[in-house]
C-alpha cells in the first residue's frame, strides 16, 4: 500500500501523458486523480510505465471502483490487465465482445492464464451461452479453447455456433467432450449434401454412435484411418467387416498398420476370421 502524501506543488496531473513516467510511486499516488485516470485509460498503454508504476495506477482504480471496474474502463485496460488477479476479474461485468477482444489481444501468443480463463468464464456466463461470434473470437486466440471446457459447459453451446469450429479446435478434445459436441454438429450440418456433410462432420465423429457410422458406410465417404482411430470403441465394435470396408473405402488397407492399436484391435478381436479374411490383409482375430 502506498502511503498518503500531499502532491508537490505544480505536479498535479492534468492529463495522463508521458511526463508521468518520471514520477515516483508516491508522486503518482498523490498527484494522479483516479477519476482522471479512469477517463483517460486509453492513454496508459501508449506510455512505458514500469510494473511498479502500473501497480500504483491499479491501486487507484481499485480505490475508485471497489465493487469492480465499469466496462468503459475495462475495455481500455490494455497491458494493465496483466496486473489483474482472477479475484479482481470476478467483480467485473463484461458484456461487449470488443472488450473481450481487446483484453485477449494483450495476452496474445501466451498460454491461457488464470486471468484470461476467469475473464472468458465471466463473459460467457454473462451472455448465457457460447454464441457463434464469441466462439469465433475465442478459438481464434486459443485454438484449444473448446476442449478446455467441461462436457457440462459444452452443453450450453448452441448448434449454430458449431459452424465456427475448425478441425484443429477439436484436436485436444476427449471422448466425453465429443459426445456432447457431435449431436450439435449433426444438427448444425443436417441440411448439407452427403460429401459436404462428411467434410464438416468428420472432426466430430469421435462422438458418433454406431447407427450413424453404419449410415455413413452407405455413402461412399472413404473415411481416413486417422478419423477411424478416433471413433468411440463402443460405436466401432458392432460394425461388420463389410460395413468397415465400405466406411474406409480405399483406406481399409490401413487397418493392417493399426491392428495392435485401439479401437482396431478390439474390433478385429470380435470379428469372425472368415470375414476378416475377405479383406485380404492378413488380420488375425
Amino acid at each position: 500500500e502506498v502511503e498518503k502524501t500531499a502532491c508537490p506543488s505544480g505536479k498535479k496531473a492534468r492529463e495522463i501523458d508521458e511526463s508521468l513516467i518520471f514520477y515516483k510511486k508516491w508522486e503518482l499516488e498523490a498527484c494522479v486523480d483516479a477519476a482522471l485516470l479512469a477517463t483517460q485509460m486509453d492513454r496508459v498503454n501508449a506510455i512505458p510505465f514500469t510494473y511498479e508504476q502500473l501497480d500504483v495506477l491499479k491501486h487507484k482504480l481499485d480505490e475508485l471502483y471497489p465493487q469492480g471496474y465499469p466496462e468503459s474502463v475495462i475495455q481500455h485496460l490494455g497491458y494493465l490487465f496483466l496486473k489483474m488477479s482472477p479475484e479482481d476479474i470476478r467483480k467485473w461485468n463484461v458484456t461487449s465482445l470488443e472488450t473481450l477482444k481487446a483484453l485477449l489481444e494483450v495476452n496474445k501468443g501466451h498460454e491461457m492464464s488464470p486471468q484470461v480463463a476467469t475473464l472468458i468464464d465471466r463473459f460467457v456466463k454473462g451472455r448465457g451461452q457460447l454464441d457463434k461470434d464469441t466462439l469465433d473470437t475465442l478459438t481464434a486466440f486459443y485454438p484449444g479453447y473448446l476442449c478446455s471446457l467441461s462436457p457440462e459447459e459444452l452443453s450450453s453451446v448452441p448448434p449454430s455456433s458449431i459452424w465456427a469450429v475448425r478441425p484443429q479446435d477439436l484436436d485436444t478434445c476427449d471422448p466425453r467432450q465429443l459426445d456432447v459436441l457431435y449431436p450439435k454438429a449433426r444438427l448444425a450440418f443436417q441440411n448439407m449434401n452427403g460429401s459436404e456433410y462428411f467434410v464438416k462432420i468428420q472432426s466430430f465423429l469421435g462422438g458418433a454412435p454406431t447407427e450413424d457410422l453404419k449410415a455413413l458406410s452407405q455413402q461412399n465417404v472413404s473415411m481416413d484411418l486417422a478419423t477411424f482411430m478416433k471413433l468411440r470403441t463402443d460405436a466401432v465394435l458392432p460394425l461388420t467387416v463389410a460395413e468397415v470396408q465400405k466406411l474406409l473405402g480405399p483406406h481399409v488397407e490401413g487397418l493392417k498398420a493399426e491392428e495392435r492399436h485401439r479401437p482396431v484391435r478390439d474390433w478385429i478381436l470380435r470379428q469372425r476370421q472368415d470375414d476378416l479374411d475377405t479383406l485380404g490383409l492378413g488380420l488375425q482375430g
Epitope: P175, R176, M229, T233, L237, R260, R262, L269, G285
Partner: antibody, heavy 119, light 107 residues
Framework: QVQLQESGPGLVKPSETLSLTCTVS??????????WSWIRQPPGKGLEWIGY???????NYNPSLKSRVTISVDTSKNQFSLKLSSVTAADTAVYYC???????????WGQGTMVTVSS | DIQMTQSPSSLSASVGDRVTITCRAS??????LNWYQQKPGKAPKLLIY???SLQSGVPSRFSGSGSGTDFTLTISSLQPEDFATYYC?????????FGGGTKVEIK
C-alpha cells in the same frame, strides 16, 4: 457382481512351469465386451501385464514374455489359465487375474496369489 | 512398445492438499489412459479410464486430464484413505504397459 479368484501352487521350482487358474463367478467368461488378463507384481515393484485371452481363444501376450507364456480359456468351467514356462527367481511375484472391460480398463481384479520360484 | 513414465516416483502430502501426478507416454496414445490406486497387500483399483472418465463408485475428488502423450491425475483434496501407490496404464497399444507408480505418503 463379477468376482475373480486365482488358484494354483504358491511354490514353483526353477526351470519348471508355473500354472495358475482364474475362476470367474457372477458373470461369463464368454462376454462380448471383455478380455481376461494376467498381471503380475514382483515384491516391492510395479505392475507388469502378462497377456490376455478372449473367449474365442484369441490371445495377446507381452512381447517380453511371449516365448514362455500360454493363456487358455475353458468356457464350460468359466475359467481361464496361465502357464509360464522355464521360470526363474525373477518370476517370483503376486499374480493377479483381471477383467479388461473394453470401454474402461481392468475394472475387476482377483485378490492375487503369491508365487515364489525357489528350489 | 510404448513406454509410460510417471512422475514423481513418490511424494509427501498432507490431508487436504491438492495432489497432481503426471504420466507421459513415449508416443501418442490418444485418450487411452487409465489410472489405478493400489494399497499395500491389495489388488489395484481402477479410478479413471479414457484419460478423464471417473469409474463408478470413485469419489469426485479424483480427476484425470490429458490426451496424446501427457496426462495428469489430480486429487483435489487428499483424504486419509488416499495414501497409496498410483499407476497409469495405456490400453491403446497391445503391449498394455503400466507406469512405474507414484507412492503418495503422509507428510
Amino acid at each position: 457382481q463379477v468376482q475373480l479368484q486365482e488358484s494354483g501352487p504358491g511354490l514353483v521350482k526353477p526351470s519348471e512351469t508355473l500354472s495358475l487358474t482364474c475362476t470367474v463367478s457372477g458373470g461369463s467368461v464368454s462376454s462380448f465386451t471383455d478380455t481376461w488378463s494376467w498381471i503380475r507384481q514382483p515384491p516391492g515393484k510395479g505392475l507388469e501385464w502378462i497377456g490376455y485371452i478372449y473367449y474365442s481363444g484369441s490371445t495377446n501376450y507381452n512381447p517380453s514374455l511371449k516365448s514362455r507364456v500360454t493363456i487358455s480359456v475353458d468356457t464350460s468351467k468359466n475359467q481361464f489359465s496361465l502357464k509360464l514356462s522355464s521360470v526363474t527367481a525373477a518370476d517370483t511375484a503376486v499374480y493377479y487375474c483381471a477383467r479388461d472391460f473394453v470401454l474402461s480398463g481392468f475394472d475387476i481384479w482377483g485378490q492375487g496369489t503369491m508365487v515364489t520360484v525357489s528350489s | 512398445d510404448i513406454q509410460m513414465t510417471q512422475s514423481p516416483s513418490s511424494l509427501s502430502a498432507s490431508v487436504g492438499d491438492r495432489v497432481t501426478i503426471t504420466c507421459r507416454a513415449s508416443q501418442s496414445i490418444s485418450s487411452y489412459l487409465n489410472w489405478y490406486q493400489q494399497k499395500p497387500g491389495k489388488a489395484p483399483k481402477l479410478l479413471i479410464y479414457a484419460a478423464s472418465s471417473l469409474q463408478s463408485g470413485v469419489p469426485s475428488r479424483f480427476s484425470g486430464s490429458g490426451s496424446g502423450t501427457d496426462f495428469t491425475l489430480t486429487i483435489s483434496s487428499l483424504q486419509p484413505e488416499d495414501f497409496a501407490t498410483y499407476y497409469c496404464q495405456q490400453p491403446y497399444d497391445a503391449s498394455y504397459t503400466f507406469g512405474g507408480g507414484t507412492k503418495v505418503e503422509i507428510k
